[in-house]
């Protein structure tokens, strides 16, 4: 099972002091969001137990393997379901904690119920504040059952669930009708996928016999040990205040594990730490009891004393759970509870034993999960013990499981089971990924998904030129870092493969699939310079440049011109795709803009050094608007326009353009040129009598300028229909600009 613990601090005098901490003992836990270790997630799960929204909770990460949730402001924030998710890939595991309000109307006698498939589960809700109304039971948030308040037995409402199956698992609640859901009793039911003592896909395998309240996992047969116990069968007690699969974690604070609830992966659920009991885990075990929730009884023999954290402490000359075994009986010593080997290796396993009479080589044997018995090839005899060494045949996956070392003498016998995990060396499922390339180097990401088992201890990158028969070059890299392959040949294809290794002898996996990575072509080294440039219009620029003369062919595919508009923070890039070109016309530029210009040679995707920059100012697009435009009717067909020249002209005006439109008319306006720019008045002729017209005008230098204000004027009455407006008599000859 994944080494993941969710701790809830139950000292509930002040919700602001309440916190939840998720601790992972997994190698590489929470290293980040990459393939090597997804982060720990700790959150409130509002899908089933919904509570009023409050301020967001604060998540704090303490190193890579611990995350804490704080920021609870009121007691109702605490009520509900919290979950921690940790572990990678197929081992990703969710640990769940259910929090009940201490002031609820109904309280669970026991929050977590772990039962076997086919068992009868009984959930018991104790009346804390009585209401004379129905009690509604829910399963995973949906209505399930009702009890009348008269149906309470001894102050408790019981929900009997006969013949439970795994889909019955989940969050159950008992709520008085008419009461707030926050006053409910919340329970967690965990239904193992097998009957008692069995595990595996068809429930055909026998559990190892978990001790000290450990629960056999129905998928892998491992014991999920209560907090404070370790070993394959939870046979060893941790020191007081310690927890985790290897007792590697320590309870925070001066009072050890007091006031903490521990939640472990299913099918264990939650309990107090070893030596503590009660709804808030604040009560020490009564004499003669020990372990998580004080559920275990010592029953020590032969003068043993009961320790509430570890059980029987035996006097000299005795051992065993209840001090029932004499030290004369042979005893297996210091056997590791779990060993790990790589597939197809031939490891040596040692088993040491002591006793009276003294064990000899032939009295110690090793039994594999399939029942095969191995005899030791040699034994080391020391004054206090005999160590037998076993040479194990080449390991196969079926060798995973519980092995047993057994010692037999005339004084009796002892055996110790231990778990052997046969791990499959990792094999990359994909080729490495090219990140960047240069002419003589490739930057590669070796992080790929893999089959087999982690953790990854080393990554080897093998590479050689494509279609080459030469030996592969190899580089050993850190699993989490990108690799730079250096001193390569330009414009050359390389075959690149990854090989992964896991810890231990024989941990090297097969090579992954190859991928072709090609180095870039050589960088262009020549620096051009700008010969000159000239403005061909308000938005057009002609640029020319040169290159130094060097012997040999030109290394380059073309030129890149860059124009930087510092005012707007915009860059314009123009690609000239011939390496022979020495001039280019840049169009569509912004009039009146100050540009910084440079040019550089490119080859493939690589850019050479840029020319020294030039600074170019394009003329503005046109002059400002004429000022004080005024219209005055002269007759039934003539209107005179007067104006003042624009101010701050960038050059001499070439002409004015007048726009004429009938007020409210739907047609297009007419444009009339005034070709004498020194004039400040003109007469528009050929207008219709008694008609209202709109006029505006603008000046032109190299381009047309801004429009003036619009003026309105009506022709005088009694005239004939005219043929259309003209300016003076010259406009009639030259026609109109539409």
């Amino acid at each position: 099972a994944v080494d993941l613990t969710l701790l809830a601090n139950l000292r509930l005098t002040d919700p602001q002091r309440f916190f939840l901490t998720c601790v992972s003992g997994e190698a590489g836990a929470g290293r980040g969001s990459d393939a090597w270790g997804p982060p720990l997630l700790l959150e409130k799960d509002d899908r089933i137990v919904r509570t009023p929204p409050g301020p967001p909770l604060r998540l704090a990460r303490n190193g890579s393997h611990q995350v804490t949730l704080r920021g609870f402001s009121k007691p109702s924030d605490l009520v509900g379901v919290f979950s921690c998710v940790g572990g990678a890939g197929a081992r990703r595991t969710r640990v769940i904690y259910v929090h009940n309000s201490p002031g609820a109307h109904l309280l669970p006698d026991k929050v977590t119920h772990t039962v076997n498939k086919g068992d009868t589960a009984v959930l018991s809700a104790r009346v804390h504040k009585e209401k004379q109304t129905d009690v509604i039971w829910k399963s995973n948030g949906s209505y399930f059952y009702t009890l009348d308040w008269h149906e309470a037995q001894d102050g408790r409402f019981l929900l009997q669930l006969p013949n439970v199956q795994p889909p019955s698992s989940g969050i159950y609640s008992a709520t008085y009708l008419e009461a707030s859901p926050l006053g409910s009793a919340f329970f967690r039911l965990i239904v193992r996928g097998c009957g008692a003592g069995r595990w595996g896909p068809g429930c055909t395998k026998e559990c190892p016999g978990c001790l000290h309240g450990g629960v056999c996992h129905d998928h892998d047969g491992e014991c999920v040990c209560p907090p404070g116990f370790t070993g394959t069968r939870c046979e060893q007690a941790c020191r007081e205040g310690r927890f985790g699969q290897s007792c590697q974690e320590q309870c925070p604070g001066i009072s050890g594990c007091r006031g903490l609830t521990f939640c472990l992966p299913d099918p264990y659920g939650c309990s107090c730490g070893s030596g503590w009991r009660g709804s808030q885990c604040q009560e020490a075990c009564a004499p003669g009891h020990f372990g998580a929730d004080c559920r275990l009884q010592c029953q020590c023999q032969n003068g043993g004393t009961c320790d509430r954290f570890s059980g029987c402490v035996c006097p000299s000359g005795w051992h065993g759970v209840h001090c029932e075994k004499s030290d004369r009986i042979p005893q297996i010593l210091n056997m590791a509870s779990e060993l790990e080997f790589n597939l197809e290796t031939m490891p040596r396993i040692n088993c040491a034993a002591a006793g009276n009479p003294f064990p000899v080589r032939g009295s110690i044997e090793l039994r594999k999960p399939d029942g095969t018995v191995l005899l030791s090839t040699k034994a080391i005899v020391e004054p206090e013990k005999t160590t037998a060494e076993f040479e194990v045949p080449r390991l196969v996956l079926a060798d995973s499981g519980f092995w047993e070392c057994r010692v037999s003498t005339s004084g009796g016998q002892d055996s110790r089971r231990f778990k052997v995990n046969v791990k499959v060396p990792p094999v990359p499922l994909a080729a490495p990924r090219l990140l960047t390339k240069q002419s003589r180097q490739l930057v590669v990401s070796p992080l790929v998904s893999f089959s087999g088992d982690g953790p990854i201890s080393t990554v080897r990158l093998h590479y050689r030129p494509q279609d080459s028969t030469m030996d592969w070059s190899t580089i050993v890299v850190d699993p989490s870092e990108n690799v730079t392959l250096m001193n390569l040949r330009p414009k050359t294809g390389y075959s690149v493969r990854v090989q992964l290794s896991r810890p231990g002898e024989g941990g090297e996996g097969a090579w992954g699939p190859p991928t072709l990575m090609t180095t870039d072509c050589p960088e262009p080294l020549l620096q051009p310079w700008l010969e000159g440039w000239h403005v061909e219009g308000t938005d057009r620029l002609r640029v020319s440049w040169s290159l130094p003369l060097v012997p040999g062919p030109l290394v380059g595919d073309g030129f890149l011109l860059r124009l930087w508009d510092g005012t707007r923070g915009q860059e314009r890039r123009e690609n000239v795709s011939s390496p022979q070109a020495r001039t280019a016309l840049l169009t569509g530029l912004t009039p009146g803009t100050h540009y910084q210009l440079d040019v550089q040679l490119y080859h493939c995707t690589l850019l050479g050094p840029a020319s020294p920059p030039a600074h170019v100012l394009l003329p503005p697009s046109g002059p400002p608007a004429p000022r004080h435009l005024h219209a005055q009717a002269l007759s039934d067909s003539e209107i005179q326009l007067t104006w003042k020249h624009p101010e701050a002209l960038p050059g001499p005006i070439s002409k004015y353009v007048v726009e004429v439109q009938v007020a409210g008319g739907a047609g297009d306006p007419l444009w009339i040129d005034v070709d004498r720019p020194e004039e400040t008045s003109t007469i528009i002729r050929g207008l219709n009598a008694s008609t209202r017209y709109l006029f505006r005008m603008r000046a032109s230098i190299q381009g047309l300028g801004d429009w003036s204000n619009t003026v309105e004027e009506s022709t005088l009455g009694n005239g004939l229909q005219a043929e259309g407006p003209v300016q003076e008599s010259r406009a009639a000859e030259e026609g109109l600009d539409q």
Epitope: D134, T146, A179, P181
Partner: antibody, heavy 127, light 107 residues
Framework: EVQLLESGGGLVQPGGSLRLSCAAS????????MFWVRQAPGKGLEWVSG????????VYADSVKGRFTISRDNSKNTLYLQMNSLRAEDTAVYYC????????????????????WGQGTLVTVSS | DIQMTQSPGTLSLSPGERATLSCRAS???????LAWYQQKPGQAPRLLIY???SRATGIPDRFSGSGSGTDFTLTISRLEPEDFAVYYC????????FGQGTNVEIK
């Protein structure tokens, strides 16, 4: 689909007995409170009796207490009403109904309601 | 036992009008215990409102409930032709009593 089907109604003389049945389908019958509600011709609805899922707790209107017995067989998904000492005023259409419990809001208290009803069976008590 | 009294006994209205039905309890009733039902001739009742103000599944939003303590109201904002029926309130307290009903008829 949830269905409730009453049967067993008919004509009976005053002082006589009758047993009504209500066959339930489409839901987990063994988890729900069930009611009998009646309606005299041209009159309003009158709650008669209720039974809790286990069958261990029953409730009755004062007007039928001691004469009517409600029961259930969870293995057969059937609700019963045994009516003894019938009177003319017991003449009515008898409906069976399921009590459901709702979360009136995400966080508020649970509220009951009769969400499914049968079509009713007519009981006529007359000499 | 708690008595439930509905008023008026009959309400004559035209389609599109607003209907306001009253239900009064003889003693205080928890809001979560009050429900409203609709019954059409020859049919079984149908749950409209539970918890005094929450609409049951499939009930149009022109139906709304309100009230607390002893006074509760069912409002139909714009009467549709299919809304003309008898309406009952019910409390789920000590005895699960119904009101005597309000008949909403077409004027």
């Amino acid at each position: 689909e949830v269905q409730l089907l009453e049967s067993g109604g008919g004509l009976v003389q005053p002082g006589g007995s009758l047993r009504l049945s209500c066959a339930a389908s489409g839901f987990t019958f063994s988890g729900y409170v069930m009611f009998w509600v009646r309606q005299a011709p041209g009159k309003g609805l009158e709650w008669v009796s209720g039974i809790y899922p286990s069958g261990g707790w029953t409730v009755y209107a004062d007007s039928v207490k001691g004469r009517f017995t409600i029961s259930r067989d969870n293995s057969k998904n059937t609700l019963y009403l045994q009516m003894n000492s019938l009177r003319a005023e017991d003449t009515a259409v008898y409906y069976c109904a399921r009590v459901n419990y709702y979360d009136s809001s995400g966080y508020g208290p649970i509220a009951p309601g009769l969400d499914y009803w049968g079509q009713g069976t007519l009981v006529t008590v007359s000499s | 036992d708690i008595q439930m009294t509905q008023s008026p006994g009959t309400l004559s209205l035209s389609p599109g009008e607003r209907a306001t039905l009253s239900c009064r309890a003889s003693q205080s009733v928890s809001s979560s215990y009050l429900a409203w039902y609709q019954q059409k001739p020859g049919q079984a009742p149908r749950l409209l409102i539970y918890g005094a103000s929450s609409r049951a599944t499939g009930i149009p939003d022109r139906f709304s409930g309100s009230g607390s303590g002893t006074d509760f109201t069912l409002t139909i904002s714009r009467l549709e032709p299919e809304d003309f029926a008898v309406y009952y309130c019910q409390q789920y307290g000590s005895s699960r009593t119904f009101g005597q009903g309000t008949n909403v008829e077409i004027k």
